[in-house]
């Protein structure tokens, strides 16, 4: 007997569907109607045939009352080839739901997204997460997707993007976006970051995550942020192979005074990078390759410093004299 594709937990809170059959029984997903958190994995299926069975142009208002009754707040859709028209149809219907967080992963979006009809209402998401989603429309995908969303989006995460740079002139501003996560785009680099951070389109960003994005120096990132007018409070540059030294010919970059938290962990640093902000609330330099203690002008003024997992602190690899103060904690780096 084949296992049930959908499983709903005892609290009717979380429902997970794995449709791995070549011709799945999609009606099984109806048992998720009472769930708050729903995950649907389509096993890499091409959903093109679906278009024949649904009227993508039908007025979604006819489903409004039914959709409003759904409890779903978080929806994850993954592993499928989805026609843009079908995605738009789903977004139009979901606009009447109470959905707040949408995650799309391992999807291939085919075709172009039609423009939002005048009478249509956008989806009022607070969080949109995309991981390994490819778009037939190349660089204009964000602008096309954006028109189907209300302007209140607070969190945007784009990982393993096939085109992490956007067509900036087509993108509208994200006035409420406070968190932007471009992590896990190793090909992005500092030039790509400049292209992705469309100037003045992200005026409210407070948290910017750039883990594993091919960044090279904190100063290079500083320049990209300055060029885009982005002034985050918190910046995560962990899991990049960072160079500590700055090209002497490169112009000095003044960090925004808004920045108070900087994560430089797992960055392969052999010394504290030059050109850091003068004052920070939080600085994470854990799990690097610092083989000697910093001297007083090598660290900014920091309230909360993390250095665990560096060779100079690990007993046996460096020999601090008995009076020096080690953390005693050796994290798994």
């Amino acid at each position: 007997t084949t296992p049930e594709p959908c499983e709903l937990d005892d609290e009717d809170f979380r429902c997970v569907c794995n449709f791995s059959e070549p011709q799945p029984d999609w009606s099984e997903a109806f048992q998720c109607v009472s769930a708050v958190e729903v995950e649907i994995h389509a096993g890499g299926l091409n959903l093109e045939p679906f278009l024949k069975r649904v009227d993508a142009d039908a007025d979604p208002r006819q489903y409004a009352d039914t959709v409003k009754a759904l409890r779903v707040r978080r929806l994850t859709v993954g592993a499928a080839q989805v026609p843009a028209q079908l995605l738009v149809g789903a977004l139009r219907v979901l606009a009447y739901s109470r959905l707040k967080e949408l995650t799309l992963e391992d999807l291939k979006i085919t075709g172009t997204m039609p423009p939002l009809p005048l009478e249509a209402t956008g989806l009022a998401l607070s969080s949109l997460r995309l991981r390994n989603v490819s778009w037939a429309t190349g660089r204009s995908w964000l602008a096309e997707l954006q028109q189907w969303l209300k302007p209140g989006l607070k969190v945007l995460s784009i990982a393993q993007a096939h085109s992490p740079a956007f067509s900036c002139e087509q993108v509208r501003a994200f006035p409420a976006l406070t968190s932007l996560d471009l992590s896990d785009n190793p090909g992005l680099g500092e030039r790509g970051l400049m292209a992705a951070l469309c100037p003045h389109k992200f005026p409210a960003i407070q948290n910017l995550a750039l883990r594993n994005t091919g960044m090279e120096t904190p100063t290079g990132v500083c320049a990209a942020l300055a060029a885009a007018g982005v002034q985050p409070h918190s910046l995560d540059l962990s899991h990049n192979s960072l160079r500590a030294t700055v090209n002497p010919s490169a112009p000095r970059c003044m960090w925004s005074s808004a920045l108070n938290s900087l994560n430089l962990s797992f960055a392969g640093l052999e010394q504290v990078p030059k050109g850091l902000p003068a004052k920070l609330r939080v600085l994470d330099l854990s799990c690097n390759r610092l083989n000697r203690a910093p001297q007083p002008d090598e660290l900014p003024e920091v309230d909360n410093l993390t250095l665990d997992g560096n060779p100079f602190l690990v007993p046996g690899t460096a020999l601090p004299h008995e009076g020096s103060m080690n953390s005693g904690v050796v994290p798994a780096c």
Partner: antibody, heavy 125, light 108 residues
Framework: EVKLLESGGGLVQPSQTLSISCKAS????????MNWVKQAPGDGLKWMGW????????TYADDFKQRFVFSLETSASTAYLQINNLNIEDTATYFC??????????????????WGPGTMVTVSS | YIVMTQTPTSISISVGERVTMNCKAS??????VDWYQQKTGQSPKLLIY???NRYTGVPDRFTGSGSGTDFTFTISNMQAVDLAVYYC??????????FGGGTKLELK
Amino acid sequence: EVKLLESGGGLVQPSQTLSISCKASGYTFTDYAMNWVKQAPGDGLKWMGWINTQTGKPTYADDFKQRFVFSLETSASTAYLQINNLNIEDTATYFCTRSTFYYSSYIYGWYFDFWGPGTMVTVSS
Amino acid sequence: YIVMTQTPTSISISVGERVTMNCKASQNVGSNVDWYQQKTGQSPKLLIYKASNRYTGVPDRFTGSGSGTDFTFTISNMQAVDLAVYYCMQSNTNPPWTFGGGTKLELK
């Protein structure tokens, strides 16, 4: 065993230049910053400034920005304090002391854990 | 720069007594205060760092406390070997660093 030893003090005339050396041993010289501290007779301790032993960059306290020069001879594990245009107020014992970094769960700083015995400089005509 | 005002400038004390001295910073220095002992004709020795941490090998009769602008150094059971001048120093995470004027311990 960590040791710091100052030398070069003595009786000097006003307007002359004096160089005091601080020889370090028992540790890797470039791993720790070096500070200079002045103590006039019957007086308290006055922090003069410090030098980064990796880069050679000196930092001077406000009262010591004019006639004082910190330098290094890294290969000899030695730091130097040069005082130009000496005057009577420079009569003092000069100490070198190393800054050691400490760290424990978010808290960090530097303290002066090893000091030289000091060298006495008397400026008199 | 930060001024460290140490009080009193001298204390007359008998062996076995408890001694307390104070240090006031002209602005908030968090817990970045160290205490040093200097005996006549010797160089200073570190006793307490980061306001309350006893340095290696320092007897537990020496304690430090305080944060912000007000700091206290205590010797719980005065010994004759403790006769010295005691200095506080603000060691804010970035220089400049400054010493207090010192408190001299003398025998009654």
